[in-house]
């Protein structure tokens, strides 16, 4: 089975300068910002059968490193 896409969530990030859990690393500005500003994937409602409108992450992958998902290394700001 193909490994799921990785996450840029703060909780996946090791030291030295990780994002806090409520923040996500924005590659375009190269620092941590509130995850809501980046339109992170929203979990599907329970029982929903149609695919989510966005294609970024599946719901179970949107909250950090889960089963079968490698944690994303986030070094300090470039």
């Amino acid at each position: 089975m193909r490994r799921g896409p990785r996450s840029l969530r703060g909780r996946d990030a090791p030291a030295p300068t990780p994002c806090v859990p409520a923040e996500c690393f924005d590659l375009l500005v190269r620092h941590c910002v509130a995850c809501g500003l980046l339109r992170t994937p929203r979990p599907k409602p329970a029982g929903a059968s149609s695919p989510a409108p966005r294609t970024a992450l599946q719901p179970q992958e949107s909250v950090g490193a889960g089963a079968g998902e490698a944690a994303l290394p986030l070094p300090g700001l470039l």
């Epitope: 990785r6 996450s7 840029l8 690393f25 375009l28 500005v29 992170t40 490698a70």
Partner: antibody, heavy 118, light 111 residues
Framework: EVQLQESGPSLVKPSQTLSLTCSVT????????WNWIRKFPGNKLEYMGY???????YYNPSLKSRISITRDTSKNQYYLQLNSVTPEDTATYYC????????????WGQGTSVTVSS | DIVLTQSPASLAVSLGQRATISCRAS??????????MNWFQQKPGQPPKLLIY???NQGSGVPARFSGSGSGTDFSLNIHPMEEDDTAMYFC?????????FGGGTKLEIK
Amino acid sequence: EVQLQESGPSLVKPSQTLSLTCSVTGDSITSGYWNWIRKFPGNKLEYMGYISYSGSTYYNPSLKSRISITRDTSKNQYYLQLNSVTPEDTATYYCASPNYPFYAMDYWGQGTSVTVSS
Amino acid sequence: DIVLTQSPASLAVSLGQRATISCRASESVDNYGISFMNWFQQKPGQPPKLLIYAASNQGSGVPARFSGSGSGTDFSLNIHPMEEDDTAMYFCQQSKEVPWTFGGGTKLEIK
């Protein structure tokens, strides 16, 4: 579902300013990145620039002296202005928004065709 | 800017067979363990449709016959089995750094 819709004149005279609007429904332009891309008649795609959740902008250096991207958050619209156009700016113009964290553009408008001609 | 070189420029494949399109980047598009390479399909009069993101992940609603692979500078899009509906232009695009750039496109037709 998020939808983007471009609007603006289909014909612009050389040396004038091309002005387009992207109207966004289903999400707020105060989150994410909001982009302009164009496709030339020969099938080449060119990335033009973005306006971000904070209102900051990035412009492709190839267009930097001529381009401006602005927004009106109250209308949930963002805009493209391209100054001093020439026939080489004839293209189909798209607005688009990328996913996170992969920055792959999965939302696109239908595109609007603009011809620069006198 | 990162230059993406797509090949071939055009391709004709028989129904049911495999189509392979390649994309080479002038420098690595990998960052933070992710390959920031995406593939789009575009049909006349329509906007590009995201097929594959982050090199190998299928976009929403994309059929399983579309797959992507690669890392660093060399990537490929595979379509198997080829279907009539797959006749279109295909573009690779990097989202590692701005200005985001596109390949020159591959026109895929049925043989």
